[in-house]
């Protein structure tokens, strides 16, 4: 059983406030910022995590070339609007009534507009490409060992079903992890690839979202895998809609 039942903490999300006020005196944890109850047996949604963060004090061994429609999160942090299930609302606006549409991982997928901007649906990000560069090592990692270790990491630490880790590519020093998850593939209870990628990103940056102070320890046959650069590309089920002005800038 989890520490949440003993200490009343949330093993999977340190950005929570927990108290034994659930049914039968059970531990219940609420996300900072939104106050929404979270399930501490799985990952918290990226939307709620971003909201909590903003509320806190201030192979053929070939590498994948991201598609022309791939999005990179250049906008950085913002205080998002989340729906009752903790997902991003399709339309996000800031305090100055500037609005834009986002995908299921909260990344902007349209030009910015005003309050009249319509975002008809939350478009799903079905393919995530995590591009890593590792620090120099004595030799290259064995590709099959690296593949197995990263798949195990996503299964055990992030609780992501193995079928959603589509591929692990390696050309020293670049590692690429491909996550794929269509709407039709995602069953109730499955961790979302966007949430798993966000937890991984924060772990790699030394900003673990899990309870505790230890952080990520990733080794391949005993050799520490230390990442010095991370880029994440997001591909949506429907291509993004940006004006030509942005594309040629």
């Amino acid at each position: 059983h989890t520490a949440a039942q003993d200490n009343c903490t949330c093993p999977t999300n340190k950005m929570t406030v927990c108290s034994p006020d659930g049914p039968g005196g059970r531990c219940q944890c609420r996300a900072l910022g939104s106050g929404m109850a979270v399930d501490c047996s799985t990952l918290t949604s990226k939307c709620l995590l971003l909201k909590a963060r903003m509320s806190a004090p201030k192979n053929a061994r070939t590498l994948v070339r991201p598609s022309e429609h791939a999005l990179v999160d250049n906008d950085g942090l913002y205080d998002p609007d989340c729906d009752p299930e903790g997902r991003f609302k399709a339309r996000q606006c800031n305090q100055t009534s500037v609005c834009w549409c986002v995908n299921s991982v909260g990344v902007r997928r349209t030009d910015k507009g005003d309050l009249s901007l319509r975002c008809d649906e939350l478009v799903r990000t079905h393919h995530i490409l995590i591009d890593l560069r590792h620090r120099p090592t004595a030799g290259a990692f064995n590709h099959s060992d690296l593949d197995a270790e990263l798949r195990r990491l996503f299964r055990e630490r992030y609780r992501l079903h193995p079928k959603f880790v589509a591929a692990v590519h390696y050309e020293q020093p670049t590692i690429q992890i491909e996550l794929r998850q269509n709407t039709s593939q995602k069953a109730a209870g499955d961790v979302d690839i966007g949430d798993a990628a966000y937890y991984f990103e924060r772990d790699i940056k030394g900003e673990s979202l899990f309870q505790g102070r230890g952080g990520l320890d990733l080794r391949v046959r005993g050799e520490p895998l230390q990442v010095e650069r991370t880029l994440i590309y997001y591909l949506d089920e429907i291509p993004p809609k940006f004006s030509m002005k942005r594309l040629t800038a």
């Epitope: 059983h1 989890t2 520490a3 003993d6 200490n7 903490t9 093993p11 999977t12 195990r152 990491l153 055990e156 630490r157 673990s208 899990f210 309870q211 505790g212 102070r213 230890g214 952080g215 990520l216 320890d217 990733l218 080794r219 005993g222």
Partner: nanobody, 128 residues
Framework: QVQLQESGGGSVQAGGSLRLSCAAS????????MGWFRQASGKEREGVAQ????????SYADSVKGRFTISQDNAKNTLYLQMNSLKPEDTAVYYC?????????????????????WGQGTQVTVSS
């Protein structure tokens, strides 16, 4: 589903020895920070020892240094605590705990909040 099951507790005279075992399942045993904690009646849970099962680095509470030894058997997915020169003040319920898979140990101190999953505990009673 992470599961931990302690065994090996019991009653012993002061100066005696016991060996606690913790059978683990539901995660890759050699990729985690694992520890032993204890809770005496009416007192808070306190750290006893911890080890990163992938690297073997260990740390101990001052009160047990030189008397207790934490070890592991990766083939059996089992964590051990060898307790020698037991004292009456070692009387407590002993718990096995593990952090998130692939989580490093935090070595400055042994805090329950750094561990995510817990066993049910095994009673150790030391009489003088």
């Amino acid at each position: 589903q992470v599961q931990l099951q302690e065994s090996g507790g019991g009653s012993v005279q002061a100066g005696g020895s016991l060996r606690l075992s913790c059978a683990a399942s539901g995660f890759t045993f050699s990729r985690a920070c694992m520890g032993w904690f204890r809770q005496a009646s009416g007192k808070e849970r306190e750290g006893v020892a911890q080890v990163y099962t992938g690297g073997g680095s260990t740390s101990y509470a001052d009160s047990v240094k030189g008397r207790f030894t934490i070890s592991q058997d990766n083939a059996k997915n089992t964590l051990y605590l060898q307790m020698n020169s037991l004292k009456p003040e070692d009387t407590a319920v002993y718990y096995c705990a593990v952090g998130q898979p692939y989580g490093a140990c935090y070595y400055s101190d042994l805090a329950p909040a750094d561990f995510s999953y817990w066993g049910q505990g095994t009673q150790v009673t030391v009489s003088s």
